[in-house]
């Protein structure tokens, strides 16, 4: 659920949650499944060449409320969605890149400081 450009984090569970992980598997994961006291997530972001990259995995409870809030970051195209309703719920998350802003069209995907 998004309001004013932010998505709110779902309610954490009183038991361990298993999530699919891809490009973001911790050492204690098994067969691309991680476990957490917090949330499963799927995130899409642009890499340095402007290509969309999807990562998924586990977010620990501590600090994940903030991470799941998907606050827009200037000059960074990124979107994250979180879930807790069932194990591997992030298999069904499909965040999309936010639209390019006018300024981004001018600058292109690579920003020089």
């Amino acid at each position: 659920k998004k309001e004013d450009g932010e998505s709110t984090a779902p309610t954490p569970r009183p038991k361990i949650l298993r999530c699919k992980c891809h490009h973001h598997c911790p050492e204690d994961s098994v067969n691309n499944i991680c476990s957490t006291d917090g949330y499963c997530f799927t995130m899409i972001e642009e890499d340095d060449s402007g290509m969309p990259v999807v990562t998924s995995g586990c977010l620990g409870l501590e600090g994940s409320d903030f991470q799941c809030r998907d606050t827009p970051i200037p000059h960074q195209r990124r979107s994250i969605e979180c879930c807790t309703e069932r194990n591997e719920c992030n298999k069904d998350l499909h965040p999309t890149l936010p639209p390019l802003k006018n300024r981004d069209f001018v600058d292109g995907p690579i920003h020089h400081k």
């Epitope: 361990i16 501590e62 591997e88």
Partner: antibody
Framework: QVQLQQPGAEVVRPGASLKLSCKAS????????MQWIKQRPGQGLEWIGE????????MYNQKFKGKATLTVDTSSSTAYMQLSSLTSEDSAVYFC?????????WGQGTTLTVSS | DVVMTQTPLSLPVSLGDQASISCRSS???????????LHWYLQKPGQSPNLLIY???NRFSGVPDRFSGSGSGTDFTLKISRVEAEDLGVYFC?????????FGSGTKLEIK
């Protein structure tokens, strides 16, 4: 109070299959995982696997894949473990146990004897 | 699989003594969330195990304060400050950081 009720003992023939039960009470069944643990004298405790009754999601110890199958019936708050192709190596005490982030309550265990 | 090594295997004590049991894991038990899922159980003869300590140092409800847990990483200790007759039995450490979850082989606390 939390209770996990298991039958005291079962005796079966080699090669047979058996379904062990574990009836939970005193808490919301779907709010915790249910684990199954094997104990043989002199062999310590072995984790077989676990099931989340809220979505039937299972995790198994590779060693017990093909030997054990975990299921639940949420309407009766009962967890089951089916053991197949039983041999004398399967003779043991089998515990069910409630798991959130750690096991906090155990059933009394079912003593399984595989004998001809 | 993570191997949990408990020492000693047998611990003869006099009532009122302090007892100390060690548990070492073959890998760090610090989970990616930052939690350390190391727990201690007591199993009395003919009974199922009972939870004493969870996540290294947290006493489970109803567990007397003479039981304490400590440690980090791969090295953990359970201490009983003044052993009572009801404390006799087999103590197990257990980890739920890595799948498959594993247990120590047990330490038998008995009267000297």
């Amino acid at each position: 109070q939390v209770q996990l009720q298991q039958p005291g003992a079962e005796v079966v023939r080699p090669g047979a299959s058996l379904k062990l039960s574990c009836k939970a009470s005193g808490y919301t069944f779907t709010s915790y995982w249910m684990q199954w643990i094997k104990q043989r004298p002199g062999q310590g405790l072995e984790w077989i696997g676990e099931i989340d009754p809220s979505d039937n999601y299972t995790m198994y110890n590779q060693k017990f894949k093909g030997k054990a199958t975990l299921t639940v019936d949420t309407s009766s708050s009962t967890a089951y473990m089916q053991l197949s192709s039983l041999t004398s190596e399967d003779s043991a005490v089998y515990f069910c146990a409630r798991f959130g982030f750690y096991v906090d309550y155990w059933g009394q265990g079912t003593t399984l004897t595989v004998s001809s | 699989d993570v191997v949990m090594t408990q020492t000693p295997l047998s611990l003869p004590v006099s009532l009122g003594d302090q007892a100390s049991i060690s548990c070492r894991s073959s890998q760090s038990l610090v989970h990616s969330t930052g939690n350390t899922y190391l727990h201690w159980y007591l199993q009395k003869p003919g009974q199922s195990p009972n939870l004493l300590i969870y996540k290294v140092s947290n006493r489970f409800s109803g567990v007397p304060d003479r039981f304490s847990g400590s440690g980090s990483g791969t090295d953990f200790t359970l201490k009983i400050s003044r052993v009572e007759a009801e404390d006799l039995g087999v103590y197990f450490c257990s980890q739920s950081t890595h799948v498959p979850f594993t247990f120590g082989s047990g330490t038998k606390l008995e009267i000297k």
